[in-house]
């Protein structure tokens, strides 16, 4: 008789990342009988929702349903129908919604309420929509990359099955850059974490981890740009802002109402004698870098050492995975290679920012101008944040690995979030069991 393949015993999970600039839906899959093993969960799909982040729907909440429809229907297609009812769905909103909540708790609740009602209409096991804390965002990003890198596995291997593996169990730090916030998370070396708000204790797979994390709200790349513009327009003599962070020849009109709409620019707000101003790019990396540094207050530190704005930061330790916008921006600029030194990155940025806007548009004809125009700022911001903000040096730069995916799964907080909420990371090391029938060759 012919052997008939048994139906694969798998499970699925869905996490929506409701970020400040967009929403992405991730579908994860894992073998049901290996739930507690490390590294078995992998991403099978990413669906990027067309449009901006959910906080933008504050005046049009009744459109959230149609906005989410295509990606939720995609999930319905990808996951077998027999699994729909047992597939958990989680939505986590990050800094865009944290900012909206700062402005109005009522409006943020209304947006989340409509999101919940929309997601409840699908045949999955909807588990709720919530705004996650910056601390959670940092922690889950750290869990994700170390889970995917096999750092929680107790088995030592003589060969490497994942990139960046140094064959030791030393965890990677996590550097996450979004549109509205940025997170830094790592295990410091024998250092007490001086501020309790930045300390996390985990027991994972039988091992204790003392983790440092901080999320800098308003220091994501989009909000940092708004901050810089609000700071610089204060000292502009008229409604022309000559800006070194944009290419020579670039021009753009900005509404003052848009500039002051975000809580991130409140500290720079002033009454201006105009409703609009024009950015005129002058494309100078060094001046752009200097302007960005003014966003970081390094004059005050109540601890032994700080990042900026009086926030404790222990000495950096080990390797770091830099993902999300750290990766997307550096990938666009072709600066993700392990071989590119920090000095080389700076040189390339100087050249890139100095290129005339007309030339840039011709070279990258397929890229939306809004995004294209901001790579000079974003690249310069990344360098400023990593070097002056987090105190990486030319030497320690080689410990930063710009990571998009690990083993086919996106680096980011969503996988760690799902692993935690589905109880798939045990505190203790699971006991080894004899081979199951499915393991026989």
């Amino acid at each position: 008789t012919q052997n008939k393949a048994l139906p694969e015993n798998v499970k699925y999970g869905i996490v929506l990342d409701a970020g400040s600039s967009h929403t992405s839906l991730y579908i994860y899959k894992w073998p049901a009988e290996k739930e507690n093993d490390t590294g078995v969960v992998h991403q099978v799909e990413e669906c990027r929702v067309k449009g901006p982040g959910i906080s933008k729907f504050v005046q049009k909440v009744n459109e959230i349903g149609i906005y989410l429809t295509d990606c939720m229907e995609r999930a319905r297609e990808v996951i077998p129908r027999s699994q729909h009812q047992e597939t958990p769905v989680y939505l986590g909103a990050t800094a865009g919604m944290r900012l909206l909540r700062m402005e109005s708790e009522e409006l943020a609740d209304r947006v989340l309420d409509v999101v919940e009602r929309s997601l409840s209409n699908y045949p999955f096991d909807f588990q709720g929509a919530r705004i996650i804390t910056g601390q959670e965002e940092g922690a889950y990003g750290w869990i994700t990359i170390n889970y995917l890198l096999g750092k929680f596995s107790q088995k030592t291997r003589w060969f490497s099955i994942v990139p960046y593996e140094t064959n030791n169990q030393e965890t990677f730090g996590a550097l996450d850059l979004g549109g509205a916030s940025t997170q830094v998370t790592f295990v410091p070396q024998n250092q007490t974490i001086e501020s309790p708000d930045n300390a996390l204790q985990f027991r994972l797979y039988g091992k204790d981890y003392n983790v440092y994390t901080h999320s800098f709200l308003c220091y994501g790349k989009d909000q940092a740009l708004w901050q810089k513009l609000a700071k610089d327009i204060q000292v502009a003599s008229n409604e022309i802002l000559r800006d070194p962070c944009f290419h020579p020849g670039y021009k753009k009109v900005v509404n003052v109402s848009d500039l002051y709409k975000t809580p991130c620019t409140k500290r720079f707000e002033m009454t201006l004698p105009f409703q609009q101003f024009e950015i005129q790019g002058i494309g100078n990396y060094q001046q752009c870098h200097q302007s960005i540094l003014e966003l970081f207050n390094t004059s005050y530190c109540p601890y032994s050492q700080c990042a900026f704005n009086g926030i404790f930061l222990p000495p950096l330790q080990g390797d770091f995975g830099a993902f999300s916008a750290f990766y997307f921006v550096m990938k666009f600029l072709n600066l993700t290679s392990e071989k590119v030194s920090q000095e080389k990155v700076t040189e390339m940025m100087k050249k890139f920012c100095a290129q005339p806007w007309e030339e840039i548009k011709t070279s990258y004809a397929g890229v939306k101008e809004k995004y294209l125009s901001e790579y000079c700022f974003s690249g310069t911001y990344i360098l400023s944040l990593l070097l002056q903000g987090y105190h990486f040096t030319a030497d320690s730069w080689e410990h930063i690995h710009f990571i998009g995916k690990i083993q086919g799964s996106d680096a980011g907080w969503t996988l760690g979030y799902m692993l935690n909420l589905t109880n798939m990371i045990p505190a203790e090391q699971p006991l080894s069991t004899p081979l199951s029938h499915s393991t026989y060759v």
Epitope: S21, K50, G51, P52, I66, G96, K370
Partner: nanobody, 124 residues
Framework: EVQLLESGGGLVQPGRSLRLSCAAS????????MGWYRQAPGNERELVAA???????NYADSVKGRFTISRDNSKNTVYLQMNSLKPEDTAVYYC??????????????????WGQGTQVTVSS
């Protein structure tokens, strides 16, 4: 520019059906979403039903199970089949075609086109 022309409105008795049509012409490649809004006297304009370029649909709770939106891409037309009509469905129905902006500044919608509206009256 996109032009939208609605048809199919009228006076109908409660419990009966109507089918609205909206023909789109012009630069419609930039449009991902099409839908129907309605506005009763003294009320705000509300989204009734919408459909994406991939044919996925979404409905207001008040019309779920009674109204069906569909799209014929070959004819650049969107339809709203309205069954089991109630007096509270009385309103001017507007066809809308739009796409969202990806940006955190400026308006939510990058493209936003409206028809002139067609009156639907449900009365015995």
């Amino acid at each position: 520019e996109v032009q939208l022309l609605e048809s199919g409105g009228g006076l109908v008795q409660p419990g009966r059906s109507l089918r609205l049509s909206c023909a789109a012409s012009g630069d419609i490649f930039s449009i991902n979403y099409m839908g129907w809004y309605r506005q009763a006297p003294g009320n705000e304009r509300e989204l009734v039903a919408a459909i994406t370029g991939r044919g996925n649909t979404n409905y207001a709770d008040s019309v779920k199970g009674r109204f069906t939106i569909s799209r014929d891409n070959s004819k650049n037309t969107v339809y709203l089949q309205m069954n089991s009509l109630k007096p509270e469905d009385t309103a001017v129905y507007y066809c809308n075609a739009w796409d969202y902006s990806d940006y955190d500044e400026g308006p939510l919608r990058e493209y936003d086109y409206w028809g002139q509206g067609t009156q639907v009256t449900v009365s015995s």
